[in-house]
Interface confidence: medium
């Protein structure tokens, strides 16, 4: 069964700057990745970035840099200042659309006791939805 993992990390250099990493553990080819915060996309969450293998990347504040890390994983850096910046308990969700598996989404947030610059290794997060 495909799985999605989500890792949220606070940067040591900027205490309110976050890096979100997400990956898809499946054999299909990824056609779209959507990163949102505040909940799943389409269920109260707000889109931060959309990554498409051919059409490129679109991002909205507070996203600062979204990029592909591998063919099946992405990273997103969030700017660390301003009223729309994330806080420690913000939930981030990643939705991967792949063929032939369909859409898989998981969410994660900063571990409660994480030190700046540290984070738990990326482990599969609970799958919230499979379309």
């Amino acid at each position: 069964t495909p799985e999605v993992w989500v890792q949220v990390r606070m940067e040591a250099t900027e205490l309110s700057s976050f890096t979100i990493r997400c990956g898809f553990l499946g054999s299909g080819s990824i056609s779209l990745v959507t990163v949102s915060w505040g909940g799943p996309n389409g269920a109260g969450g707000t889109t931060l970035a959309v990554l498409h293998p051919e059409r490129g990347i679109r991002q909205w504040a507070p996203a600062r840099q979204a990029r592909w890390e591998t063919q099946s994983s992405i990273s997103l850096i969030l700017e660390g200042s301003g009223a729309s910046s994330p806080c420690a308990n913000t939930t981030f969700c990643c939705k991967f659309a792949s063929f032939p598996e369909g859409s898989w989404e998981a969410c994660g947030s900063l571990p409660p006791s994480s030190d700046p610059g540290l984070s738990a290794p990326p482990t599969p997060a609970p799958i919230l939805r499979a379309d």
Partner: antibody, heavy 123, light 111 residues
Amino acid sequence: EVQLQQSGAELVKPGASVKLSCTASGFNIEDTYIHWVKRRPEQGLEWIGGIDPAIGNTLYASKFQDMATITADTSSSTAYMQLSSLTSGDTAVYYCARERVYSNTLYYAMDYWGQGTSVTVSS
Amino acid sequence: DIVLTQSPASLVVSLGQRATISCRASKSVSISGYSYMHWYQQKPGQPPKLLIYLASNLESGVPARFSGSGSGTDFTLNIHPVEAEDAATYYCQHSRELPPTFGGGTNLEIK
């Protein structure tokens, strides 16, 4: 010439649904986002949502997430917006608009607009 | 959501004079050297028309008497010299984050 042709005026009853269309010509609909914007009488403009027709990816304002459904048919160069559970507050002119050609430079400005579709919700 | 406050709500300007419309954002709409603020003109019975994108870039086909400036939270649309056909409602719109929002509009009357 770039054009967005919208469907005609609609008179619908409260609680009903309506589906508006926006047909593009003069450009490839797959090269852009198509957005929908609401203008109520004597009020300003409100962004409802948008779609990337090439891949079907949609974006919505949270206010409209439950009532608006945006789709596109690239074969006919047409974008659609369905509005459900309509109330008198949804009486408005609805515009579709083309975003500047898809680009990582993040313009997100709407450079061509349809003529608007008037929707009246009344019993 | 970012709130855009336009002022004045209405403006009367003599033909050939300068019209200045202000748009203030509730937080900065500038990042990485870009200001994600755009200006539109709307006449009665017509759809909005893009005038200025990214704060200061004149849209193709728009007369050079229109100009935009500003960064951060404060932006200005200038029209000089004003012509009779400029009578319309003007809106600012940001696109820095989702959802994009519009200002309340400024109604420009020419005398």
